[in-house]
């Protein structure tokens, strides 16, 4: 697999860079804050619930809109401008790990907390089947980690 | 040697529902994405549903979407398609196929359809 | 969704000929998604070539593969009679499609 990775690597290099995952990092932020607001809770607060309803990725937020279609219905603008952008990786799973895990990497410093960090990821692992395009199996989101190896 | 047995099989009516399990040996079962394929008599391959090594991901073809559900249970190296709502068009071989997905650095990629059951035979007639 | 259009839909050939089969995708996709099966009657399929050019284990290598970018093809450079079978290429670099696929038969 060494040679598809080489030449993945410089055209999935360009990709980022030529992409603009602002978008992303705003319309997530908005969301967890939104979920915070609109369920109360604090997140400082380390005896959290981890299944509280806003975690649960099968009910959503009330206030939310609801997932991004490529219609566009009811979505909001920077979700729509997000899942334009991610749709550029959509026919390269291991571009689509590294936007993720840029994604991450630009916001870690402004999640207050390990609780709405958690949520982030969430959201974030969550983000490729909102835009209707398919997620690698699995992406490490851990900023500051080496990864696990299966082989 | 990857093995992988299908059951569950058999004639329904239009309508009902239906489910095949998948019976997998040979190799490291939760580390691998289980996918289903279906053949209909005569015709080509159609992929079907995928869940991943950790079941934390499930995807559907438009063709099934609510309608079937895919599930697994790593405890008992088992993955099951629960088909409801069957309809003719439904008639087909469903194989169960082993993605022999790629892992690196903490991250694991869809992979080759690598390894395939022997299939099992749906028929939905009136 | 991508799709992959398969050509001929029928080759007939001899034994020992040269069976050259054709893929094409609907997009560019890299050819580390591309993949091709060989399904005889009654049987599951079996994986032939993965990553568009590369046998999968227990091949033999009078099967190749190649092609880049939409065009990719399966080469069986000397047709042995155990080779008449249907082959299906497939992709996985945007969901999961298979060609409708190529049947070799004896000629």
């Known amino acids: 697999r060494q040679q598809w990775e080489l030449q993945g690597d410089r055209r999935c290099q360009s990709q980022l860079e030529r992409a603009n995952l602002r978008p992303c990092e705003q319309h997530l932020m908005q969301k967890i804050q939104r979920d915070e607001d609109s369920y109360g809770r604090d997140p400082y607060s380390p005896s959290q619930d981890p299944y509280s309803p806003s975690q649960d990725p099968d009910r959503r937020d009330p206030y939310s809109p609801s997932p991004y279609d490529r219609r566009g219905a009811g979505s909001s603008q920077h979700q729509e401008r997000c899942c334009n952008e991610l749709n550029e990786f959509e026919n390269n799973q291991r571009c689509m790990c590294e936007a993720l895990q840029q994604i991450m990497e630009n916001q870690s410093d402004r999640l207050q907390g390990r609780q709405q960090e958690q949520q982030f990821k969430r959201e974030l692992r969550n983000l490729p089947q909102q835009c209707g395009l398919r997620a690698p199996q699995r992406c490490d989101l851990e900023v500051e980690s080496g990864g696990r190896d299966r082989y | 040697q990857v093995h992988l047995v299908e059951s569950g099989g058999g004639v329904v009516q239009p309508g009902r529902s239906l489910g095949l399990s998948c019976v997998a040996s040979g190799f490291t079962f939760n580390y691998y994405a289980i996918h289903w394929v279906r053949q209909a008599p005569g015709k080509g391959l159609e992929w079907v549903a995928v869940?991943?090594?950790?079941?934390?991901?499930?995807y559907y073809a438009d063709s099934v979407k609510g309608r079937f559900n895919i599930s697994r249970d790593n405890s008992k190296n088992t993955v099951n398609l629960q088909m409801n709502s069957l309809r003719p068009d439904d008639t087909a071989v469903y194989y169960c196929?082993?993605?022999?997905?790629?892992?690196?650095?903490?991250?694991?990629?869809?992979?080759?359809?690598?390894?395939w059951g022997q299939g099992s035979l749906v028929t939905v007639s009136p | 969704e991508i799709v992959l259009t398969q050509s001929p839909a029928t080759l007939s050939l001899s034994p020992g000929e040269r069976a050259t089969l054709s893929c094409r995708a609907s997009q560019s996709i890299s050819s580390e998604y591309l993949t091709w099966f060989q399904q005889k009657p009654g049987q599951a399929p079996r994986l032939l070539i993965y990553g568009a050019f590369n046998r999968a284990t227990g091949i033999p290598d009078r099967f190749s593969g190649s092609g880049s970018g939409t065009d990719f093809t399966l080469t069986i450079s000397s047709l042995e009679p155990e080779d008449f079978a249907v082959y299906y290429c497939q992709q996985y670099a945007n969901w999961w499609t298979f060609g409708q696929g190529t049947k070799v038969e004896i000629k």
């Open positions: 869940v991943s090594f950790d079941g934390n991901i499930i």
């Open positions: 196929v082993r993605d022999g997905e790629y892992c690196s650095g903490g991250n694991c990629y869809w992979g080759d359809f690598d390894h």
